[in-house]
């Protein structure tokens, strides 16, 4: 029977450019986990598997960072990275368990860029 | 890009053959690295997977005779005591062991192997 | 031990025609389970992964389907550019097994 529970930092926004924090955390549990996936849309991004360590999917590398722990950072945020994404934890003897994260992307706001200009 | 850096070609069984796979534009710092061969005309046989800590897995038959190890770029292949047997097409590809596939593969490099 | 067993060996197909190729493992895989394609003279080219997904620029005639032991590669109106090798390859398990891929099969278009 699974007992387990995940918690995610749940619906999250962040500016274009910059960069984000994905945390999920498997608890209630005493299931060991074997490998947690980041995917988005179906395309996965990046693994984190018990015995190998990190894999950084090759079309992300240049944007996603694995860590801290088993969270995900992503990098140079364009409002395309918009969206859901998930983490799935695969633990033995429970099976898969799955976390959602929503992210949105936001323009850098006008009340910012306008205060860096003043009209004569 | 993944490249397949070695000098191939005829070894004998007293040497140690050594396969460089050196992948271009990413570090292998969070890059799981497979090493599959082809003997002539036949069917793909996994060898071994490293993982971006380092950590080894090898299949039943290559455990012992075949080492993986790799730096920041490159992956490399030991055989000690080649056997003719040994004579393939050897490729390195990216990722393996639910990574959702090996990909992009090297090109391969043929080593014979003949006393 | 997983054993990956592939069939047919071979099969022949006329253009626009539709060829299927089975893949069974000897225990459950949880759809860890990628299909490749190789020509004469080139390294595989990763076809789909996870079971049923596409990899990148793979054409949509190529499909894949199955769960548990029992996995399908399905090419709808081949081409000749399909002829070629197929090869089925477990992601499920790397400890204590001889090999993660299927023996392959030939696929030859008419």
């Known amino acids: 029977m699974m007992t387990g529970t995940i918690e995610t930092t749940g619906n999250i926004s962040a500016e274009k450019g910059g960069s984000i924090i994905l945390q999920c955390h498997l608890s209630s549990t005493t299931a060991q986990v074997t490998q947690v996936n980041w995917e988005q849309q179906d395309q996965l991004l990046a693994i984190c598997n018990a015995d190998l360590g990190w894999h950084i999917s090759p079309s992300f590398k240049d944007r996603v960072a694995p860590g801290p722990g088993l969270g995900l950072t992503l990098q140079s945020l364009t409002v395309n990275d918009t969206g859901e994404y998930f983490c799935i934890y695969h633990t033995y003897p429970d099976g898969t368990y799955t976390g959602r994260i929503f992210l949105e992307v936001l323009e850098s706001s006008v009340a910012e860029h306008g205060a860096r200009f003043q009209i004569p | 890009q993944v490249q397949l850096e070695s000098e191939g070609g005829l070894f004998k069984p007293t040497d140690t053959l050594t396969l460089t796979c050196t992948v271009s534009?990413?570090?292998?710092?969070?890059?799981?690295m497979s090493w599959v061969r082809q003997a002539p005309g036949k069917g793909l046989e996994w060898i071994g997977i490293?993982?971006?800590?380092?950590n080894t897995y090898y299949a039943n038959w290559a455990k012992g005779r075949f080492t993986i190890s790799k730096t920041s770029t490159t992956v490399e292949l030991k055989i000690t005591s080649p056997t003719t047997e040994d004579t393939a097409t050897y490729f390195c590809?990216?990722?393996?062991?639910?990574?959702?596939?090996?990909?992009?593969w090297g090109p391969g490099t043929l080593v014979t192997v003949s006393s | 031990d997983i054993v990956m067993t592939q069939t047919p060996a071979s099969v022949e197909v006329a253009v626009g025609g539709t060829v299927t190729i089975k893949c069974q493992a000897s225990?459950?895989?949880?759809?860890?389970l990628n299909w490749y394609q190789q020509k004469p003279g080139q390294p595989p080219k990763l076809l789909i992964y996870?079971?049923?997904k596409l990899a990148s620029g793979v054409p949509s005639r190529f499909s894949g389907s199955g769960s548990g032991t029992e996995y399908t590669l399905t090419i709808s109106g081949v081409e000749s550019a399909d002829a070629a090798t197929y090869y089925c390859?477990?992601?499920?398990?790397?400890?204590?097994?001889?090999?993660?891929f299927g023996g392959g099969t030939e696929v030859v278009v008419k």
């Open positions: 590809a990216r990722g393996g062991y639910r990574t959702s596939g090996m990909d992009p």
């Open positions: 534009g990413s570090s292998l710092s969070s890059s799981y």
């Open positions: 490293i993982g971006s800590n380092g």
């Open positions: 225990q459950s895989i949880s759809s860890y």
């Open positions: 996870d079971a049923l």
């Open positions: 390859q477990q992601e499920h398990s790397v400890g204590n097994v001889d090999n993660v």
